[in-house]
Amino acid sequence: VEVKVPTEPLSTPLGKTAELTCTYSTSVGDSFALEWSFVQPGKPISESHPILYFTNGHLYPTGSKSKRVSLLQNPPTVGVATLKLTDVHPSDTGTYLCQVNNPPDFYTNGLGLINLTVLVPPSNPLCSQSGQTSVGGSTALRCSSSEGAPKPVYNWVRLGTFPTPSPGSMVQDEVSGQLILTNLSLTSSGTYRCVATNQMGSASCELTLSVTEPSQGRVA
């Protein structure tokens, strides 16, 4: 049995229904069997867990996803073995295996792999600060969302109408969410907002930076 699956990875928003397309061509016999299984990201195929079986004319959902899995066509004997997974969770991200067996059709191994990513908006990020906050010193502002798929990009902006710091004294890394401020001055003080963004949305946090004279010590 030769199984056909999309070559492109599949992306489905959190809470929506994922349709994992799997088709095949074979003269379906009574021994026809379909198995869908799941592998977590980074794990080998050998560690897959079954989520649905079809055999002897009956459908058997199994495992932790059993209440949420079904087939687009039941019985899946018309050449369409497409899986529907409702109310997708972040833990549904991974590789799905569609395997069709129909002895004596051993033309190929009857296996197709589909990568699913569940799209999750960024959670409210946590803003933090470390370093020397006195004039002339340097500080790092950090921003991180615990959730978000694809991984959010981070953008820091300074609120208000204060003079803009010179470009060399304000460097940010959109991937790590870190903003490094060097050669601090009193005018560096103010409120800084970090916005975490991905294709599903955005979330933000704010942090107030207080730059002091060296003799006054470090105040956050």
Epitope: E2, K4, T23, S25, T26, S27, V28, G29, D30, S31, F32, N56, G57, P75, T77, V78, G79, V80, P104, D105, Y107
Partner: antibody
Framework: EVQLVESGGGLVKPGGSLRLSCAAS????????MSWVRQAPGKGLEWVAS????????HYPDSVKGRFTISRDNAKSSLYLQMNSLRAEDTAVYYC???????????WGQGTLVTVSS | DIQMTQSPSTLSASVGDRVTITCRAS??????LAWYQQKPGKAPKLLIY???TLPEGVPSRFSGSGSGTEFTLTISSLQPDDFATYYC?????????FGQGTKVEIK
């Protein structure tokens, strides 16, 4: 030598019923998916029913679904097509065909003519 | 349902000619295509399956090619026995459907 011989065709009134038979020989019938394919006079070919090797799975196009029933008796190496609620547009030569490992038709019978007319 | 469209409907040719018949599918059917030959009053005969595979006993002058949505049947040198009607059929997902046929007649 593979042989498929259809029988049971004839003249039937609209709304009537007919049962076609196909006697198979020359191959292991119980290992083969089977189908019925029809051809209206002067027209092309249309697949009308299929059945799996042991009879567990049957399939039909929308044009005959609910009216036609395919079945088989592996002990007799025979295939059947029960046709109910016949319409004028069901008039055709009906062929019995063996499916390959994939669903193409590698052997065909000589056909039996079904005429639906009042 | 997947629609199969053949062209031309009729083709006039002479013995020895190279003949090409086209079959188009309304959606991707990969290589799941079969070709049949039918003579008047006779049952169809399988010529090609999986777009290009010839069953045992089919003369090598017949060849098939294509994948996706566009397919061709070629007869490299037409013989007197080849005047007939040719049908394509997809063998992908049910319902399996045929093209409307191409009649190859003597010029």
């Amino acid at each position: 030598e593979v042989q498929l011989v259809e029988s049971g065709g004839g003249l039937v009134k609209p709304g009537g019923s007919l049962r076609l038979s196909c006697a198979a020989s020359g191959f292991t019938f119980s290992n083969s998916g089977m189908s019925w394919v029809r051809q209206a006079p002067g027209k092309g070919l249309e697949w009308v029913a299929s059945i799996s090797d042991g009879g567990l799975y049957t399939h039909y196009p929308d044009s005959v679904k609910g009216r036609f029933t395919i079945s088989r008796d592996n002990a007799k190496s025979s295939l059947y097509l029960q046709m109910n609620s016949l319409r004028a547009e069901d008039t055709a030569v009906y062929y019995c065909a063996r499916q390959g490992v994939q669903p193409f038709f590698d052997y065909w019978g000589q056909g039996t003519l079904v005429t639906v007319s009042s | 349902d997947i629609q199969m469209t053949q062209s031309p409907s009729t083709l006039s040719a002479s013995v020895g000619d190279r003949v090409t018949i086209t079959c188009r599918a309304s959606e991707n059917i990969y290589s799941y295509l079969a070709w049949y030959q039918q003579k008047p009053g006779k049952a169809p005969k399988l010529l090609i399956y999986n777009a290009e595979t010839l069953p045992e006993g089919v003369p090598s002058r017949f060849s098939g090619s294509g994948s996706g949505t566009e397919f061709t049947l070629t007869i490299s040198s037409l013989q007197p026995d080849d005047f007939a009607t040719y049908y394509c059929q997809h063998h992908y997902v049910i319902p399996w459907t045929f093209g409307q046929g191409t009649k190859v007649e003597i010029k």
